[in-house]
């Protein structure tokens, strides 16, 4: 009779035996035979599987280095990585997170848009006609104008995307 | 409820072809491997094929080697068995039972089973 | 392809008796056997999967046990509704195969 070609997709063939995986958070000790089941350990302390596999090695825990800015958002178990972030005002400079730099400011003329978080940086947008910004700032979006009508003053000079509006005493009609 | 209903069993005549759909509810099909088993007239119970949760590994009894093939549609739900070549011994109830893994927390190794299965569809190979 | 061979292949007993089916399969397959119960014009219906364990729902007095070649399916104390037939099935390896079947019949 012919071995068999395919297995479940909790099997694994080897030997013309369609043997178990190993469960997550365990690794392969000796594959199964007619008689024998397959053998699995748990992985030990940092480190771990996080699939259905016949790995005769657990990988170990990502170690989230403080030199590049790096510290533990979640702490890894015998099934799961250990995923890092980056410490305050500093994000990511990919998705899987091996180095930080710090979050860039908006300059003056630019507000925020998006507050930079651990793994995505700010984003900046000029400020539109009416909005300005005079600072360089990672938390400061575009301020309005201020508005001289509700303050019973009249513009006086005229605001840019990068300074607000200079407000005066409206002139006195001579009688 | 979780419930399985076999479909587009009838009379073929020898050598024809008939496509049996298997129409999975109250539950995620795509995340169960399947099978198809028949039972001829008043015999035991006999393995068909089988389809992975993607559809991408397949396996069949020799009996039908070459001329049945499974397939399934995940967005619809769906299972099928497209029979081709069909024959008098090919005359039987077919099923479409649902192949589930049983977990083991203690870390033993876990076990199969066929444990949801359709009330059958009649296929009836005669001239 | 693995063999199964069930014996008996039919069986007369009567309610409160103690049954046991046996399975023995042509090569090792470990603990991968699960048995069936049917009755006529209905789906087979899991009772045991991994050689010994219980599927959920399914009373008590059911039971199986053994390991590679040789297994077991007993009812310790049959009652009026476990009248049917039995498959054992090994999900070792492909071609799935079944056992003939064990008819229990009522005394």
């Known amino acids: 009779p012919e071995p068999p070609t395919a297995c479940r997709e909790k099997q694994y063939l080897i030997n013309s035996q369609c043997c178990s995986l190993c469960q997550p958070g365990q690794k392969l000790v000796s594959d199964c035979t007619e008689f024998t089941e397959t053998e699995c350990l748990p992985c030990g302390e940092s480190e771990f599987l996080d699939t259905w596999n016949r790995e005769t090695h657990c990988h170990q825990h990502k170690y989230c280095d403080p030199n590049l800015g790096l510290r533990v958002q979640q702490k890894g178990t015998s099934e799961t990585d250990t995923i890092c972030t980056c410490e305050e005002g500093w994000h990511c400079t990919s998705e899987a997170c091996e180095s930080c730099v710090l979050h860039r400011s908006c300059s003056p003329g630019f507000g925020v848009k998006q507050i930079a978080t651990g793994v995505s940086d700010t984003i900046c947008e000029p400020c539109p006609v009416g909005f300005f910004s005079n600072v360089s700032s990672a938390f400061e979006k575009c301020h309005p104008w201020t508005s001289c009508e509700t303050k019973d003053l009249v513009v006086q000079q005229a605001g840019t995307n990068k300074t607000d509006v200079v407000c005066g005493p409206q002139d006195r009609l001579r009688a | 409820e979780v419930q399985l209903l076999e479909s587009g069993g009838g009379l073929v005549r020898p050598g024809g072809s008939l496509r049996l759909s298997c129409a999975a509810s109250?539950?995620?099909?795509?995340?169960?491997?399947m099978n198809w088993v028949r039972q001829a007239p008043g015999k035991g119970l006999e393995w068909v094929s089988y389809?992975?949760?993607?559809?991408?590994?397949?396996d069949y009894a020799d009996s039908v080697k070459g001329r049945f093939t499974v397939s399934r549609d995940n967005s619809k739900n769906l299972l099928y068995l497209q029979m081709n070549s069909l024959r008098a011994e090919d005359t039987a109830v077919y099923y479409c039972?649902?192949?589930?893994?049983?977990?083991?927390?203690?870390?033993?190794?876990?076990?199969?089973?066929?444990?949801?299965w359709g009330q059958g569809t009649m296929v009836t190979v005669s001239s | 392809d693995i063999q199964l061979t069930q014996s008996p292949s039919s069986l007369t007993a009567s309610v409160g008796d103690r049954v046991t089916i046996t399975c023995r399969s042509s090569q090792g397959i470990r603990s991968s056997l699960a048995w069936y119960q049917q009755k006529p014009g209905k789906p087979p219906k899991l009772l045991i999967y991994g050689a010994s364990s219980l599927e959920g729902g399914v009373p008590s007095r059911f039971s199986g046990s053994g390991s590679g070649t040789d297994f077991t399916l007993t009812i310790s104390s049959l009652q009026p509704e476990d009248f049917a037939t039995y498959y054992c099935q090994q999900l070792n390896s492909f071609p799935s195969t079944f056992g003939q079947g064990t008819k229990l019949e009522i005394k």
């Open positions: 389809i992975s949760s993607s559809g991408e590994t397949t």
């Open positions: 109250g539950f995620t099909f795509g995340s169960y491997e």
């Open positions: 039972a649902r192949d589930v893994f049983f977990f083991s927390p203690s870390g033993d190794n876990g076990a199969y089973g066929m444990d949801v």
